[in-house]
């Protein structure tokens, strides 16, 4: 019996298409992915094979301006409209808080939302009782498929919960609900989840009854062959584990931002074994049609975000300097702001000792773009952020050695004076340069705000230290000449989008005054 | 390589029904769509209907409203097309035509050489 | 069913020249559309799939374009072995629908 599993992940409200580098489109003969342009796609495939299932991982929240807007209610009005047979619930589901989730998605979405490890407590528990599940049992042609869904345990950190939710480690979660499967006599069981590649590919090894794992969070892209575009594989696809019971269990993830479609095809014995996998995600090019009547759907949604960009989302009594003169110089107050926002948009309060788990926060100058001038009655408006902003990246939570960190701040000055992007605007960290040694060695004195300390305060960096971090995605991935972030980052979770942040902060605070304030100097 | 083979020339009566094969090598068989496509002499290309030989789905053109019978057969990876109750209107060359729905070429990259049937009484 | 209508049904040209053939499609089909060049006694071979995108191995004079209900084929400089019949194909709802046909011949 065959079954063609189509899966996406992280499509982090990628709704119409975008560039190849997953930003905003551009020139739409180039441009890819698309909720239209995926319907295309599933609706041929469906014409074509007899069995298919068509899954996320999780991680459809957050990440550009239709979520800002519309809250999810786009995710479950477009995943409604694709058809989805189940959805695993990714960390940044929770970015609204539960409400975020509940009344948008889970009341919404007409296909099961999944998670085995998640508990509710408290009040909360009868509130969201059935409205997402441990595991979903598909009719499927003549067969039956087990979904067991799986969430990130490091949700708490990632996102916003709440404190009557429990994130329990996923393996041990999974394997009484699979065991369960196992006794209702579903013997093709499918684990769908968003804990990234190195914990997909545990539970394969380690979930009995588990024949095929779909995941997400890490953003992996795998590939048999050629791969089709610019992502370069960190595997073959499926990527195949043996599990401890002596089973070749295929894994799959299907990179992120809706760019392609995994297409899995399993061939399972009458016992529910898998005997073959094999497959590929299929880029979602310009060669693909978007569908006329979900494209004509997504332009009559468009409108409510167009109106939105030119509303006031705060003011500001100063100007923003995001000069390249300033920002790529010395500290530039907008760095300030945005690494304020940083930090605020982290703020989780999940241990007594810790008044939070991440207190700084570092920014390449070259990504700042723009100033805001304070003279249009101090308005700020998301038009004015994407200008500022205008690469559609996230903030992401790192974890590096303070060596590492010593590193990234040398560069940041290695080559001073040429109006270079890498000069780091900071948040939580006072730093002093000497521009008269040598490059590699300019950085006099390096202070971090404590986290674990009732009243914060700076102290000297400690380079055997682990230390977290919030920067944009294009630092954690070695952009700017930080290679040494991304070969020796510890640990790295994608996420909210960058100006989504700095809206957030803004209107939070209402009025802005922002101040160039010495966590930068120069002796 | 790809190639589509189809079968031999035929002459048919009237009424009578006609079966013309497409045997596919040079590729995954059940990876990829088959059309069948008639062209009448001196005229345009019309398409009566694919079949998807891994699912075994067929889709026809109603115009042939259950005249058409498409089929595949895995083990040869050979494709068939049936037209039954023949008129002269039917006399066409046929042509089967391979669709990669998985790929991203809307359109049919391949083409057999065609088969010609003549119906005449 | 989706009607094709391909103008003109036929252009005398010489070589060296410039050549546009237009397909116009009764309902909008995303770009799913693909140009044929069929020659006497053979079977077509696919030229342009998706309105724009050249198939493996034809010469880059073909080119294509075209959104919605409207799509063009050009050929930039008529080459001898381009005299033939061309044909477009709508491949986005079935019955997948082939324009008239329009054949190039040489003046």
């Known amino acids: 019996w065959e079954l063609t599993i189509l899966h996406t992940n992280d499509v982090h409200s990628r709704l119409e298409q975008t560039s190849e580098d997953s930003s905003k489109c551009v020139n739409a003969s180039r441009c890819m992915g698309g909720v239209a342009r995926l319907f295309t796609k599933v609706q041929q495939i469906r014409r074509a094979e007899p069995n298919v299932l068509l899954l996320d991982a999780g991680d459809q929240y957050q990440g550009t301006i239709w979520f800002t807007v519309y809250k999810g209610a786009e995710v479950a009005h477009f995943m409604n409209a694709l058809r989805y047979d189940a959805m695993a619930l990714g960390n940044h589901e929770f970015d609204n808080g539960v409400e975020g989730l509940i009344e948008p998605l889970l009341k919404e979405a007409k296909f099961p939302i999944l998670s085995a490890n998640i508990k509710a407590k408290g009040p909360l528990a009868s509130q969201i009782s059935g409205l997402y599940l441990p595991y979903k049992v598909l009719p499927v042609g003549d067969e039956v498929v087990g979904i067991v869904g799986y969430t990130s345990k490091e949700t708490p950190f990632l996102s916003n919960p709440g404190t009557n939710l429990v994130f329990e480690d996923e393996i041990t979660a999974l394997q009484p609900e699979v065991d369960k499967l196992k006794t209702l006599n579903v013997n093709k069981i499918i684990a769908l989840g968003h804990s990234g590649f190195e914990m997909d590919k545990l539970i394969a090894q380690k979930v009995r009854g588990v024949d095929v794992v779909v995941g997400g969070h890490s953003n992996t892209f795998l590939y048999t062959g050629n791969p089709p575009s610019k992502e370069v594989p960190a595997g073959k696809y499926p990527f195949i584990v043996t599990s401890d019971d002596g089973r070749k269990v295929p894994v799959v993830q299907a990179y992120a931002f809706g760019k392609y479609l995994g297409y899995l095809k399993i061939e399972f014995d009458e016992r529910g074994n898998v005997i073959s996998s094999h497959g590929n995600p299929i880029l979602l090019n310009s060669s693909i049609p978007e569908d006329p009547s979900i494209k004509a759907d997504i332009n009559k949604w468009r409108i409510k975000l167009d109106n939105y960009s030119t509303q006031e989302l705060g003011k500001t009594i100063v100007y923003l300097d995001g000069s390249s003169q300033s920002c790529r110089f010395r500290e530039c107050n907008m760095g300030n702001l945005i690494c304020d926002a940083m930090i605020n948009n982290n703020l989780r309060h999940t241990d007594e000792m810790f008044w939070n788990h991440v207190s700084m926060c570092i920014l390449n100058g070259g990504g700042i773009r723009s100033p805001i001038d304070e003279r249009n009655n101090g308005t700020i408006t998301w038009e004015n952020l994407a200008a500022v902003l205008p690469f559609g990246g996230t903030f992401d939570l790192v974890q590096l050695k303070g060596s590492t960190l010593k590193k990234a701040f040398e560069h940041s000055v290695h080559r001073y004076g040429q109006s270079t992007g890498e000069f780091l605007q900071v948040g939580g960290i006072h730093v002093v340069y000497d521009l008269s040694r040598k490059p590699g060695d300019r950085v006099v004195k390096l202070d971090v705000l404590c986290t674990k300390c009732r009243v914060p305060s700076y102290d000297p960096l400690k380079m055997d230290e682990v230390y977290k971090v919030i920067l944009p995605n294009f630092l954690a991935n070695g952009g700017d000449g930080f290679q040494m972030i991304k070969d020796e980052l510890l640990r790295h979770d994608s996420g909210d989008q960058d100006i989504n942040v700095v809206s957030t902060y803004i209107s939070k605070m209402k009025v802005i005054y922002p101040a160039v304030e010495g966590r930068i100097k120069f002796s | 390589q790809v190639q589509l083979v189809q079968s031999g020339a035929e002459v048919k009566k009237p009424g009578s029904s006609v079966k013309v094969s497409c045997k596919a090598s040079?590729?995954?068989?059940?990876?990829?769509?088959l059309s069948w496509v008639r062209q009448a002499p001196g005229q345009g290309l019309e398409w009566m209907g694919e079949?998807?030989?891994?699912?075994?789905?067929?889709y026809y053109n109603e115009k042939f409203k259950g005249r058409v019978t498409i089929t595949a057969d895995e083990s040869t990876s050979t494709a068939y097309m049936e037209l039954s109750s023949l008129r002269s209107e039917d006399t066409a060359v046929y042509y089967c035509?391979?669709?990669?729905?998985?790929?991203?070429?809307?359109?049919?990259?391949?083409w057999g050489a065609g088969t010609t049937v003549t119906v005449s009484s | 069913d989706i009607q094709m209508t391909q103008s003109p049904s036929s252009l005398s040209a010489s070589v060296g020249d410039r050549v546009t053939i237009t397909c116009k499609a009764s309902?909008?089909?995303?770009?799913?559309v693909a140009w044929y060049q069929q020659k006497p006694g053979k079977a077509p071979k696919l030229l342009l799939y998706?309105?724009?995108y050249r198939y493996s191995g034809v010469p880059s004079r073909f080119s294509g374009s075209g959104s919605g209900t409207d799509y063009t084929l050009t050929i930039s400089s008529l080459q001898p072995e381009d005299f033939a019949t061309y044909y477009c194909?709508?491949?986005?709802?079935?019955?997948?629908?082939f324009g008239g046909g329009t054949k190039l011949e040489i003046k």
């Open positions: 035509a391979r669709y990669d729905y998985l790929g991203s070429s809307y359109g049919f990259d391949y």
């Open positions: 040079g590729y995954t068989f059940t990876s990829y769509g």
């Open positions: 079949i998807y030989p891994g699912s075994g789905n067929t």
């Open positions: 309902q909008d089909v995303s770009t799913a």
């Open positions: 998706s309105a724009s």
């Open positions: 194909q709508q491949h986005y709802n079935t019955p997948y629908t």
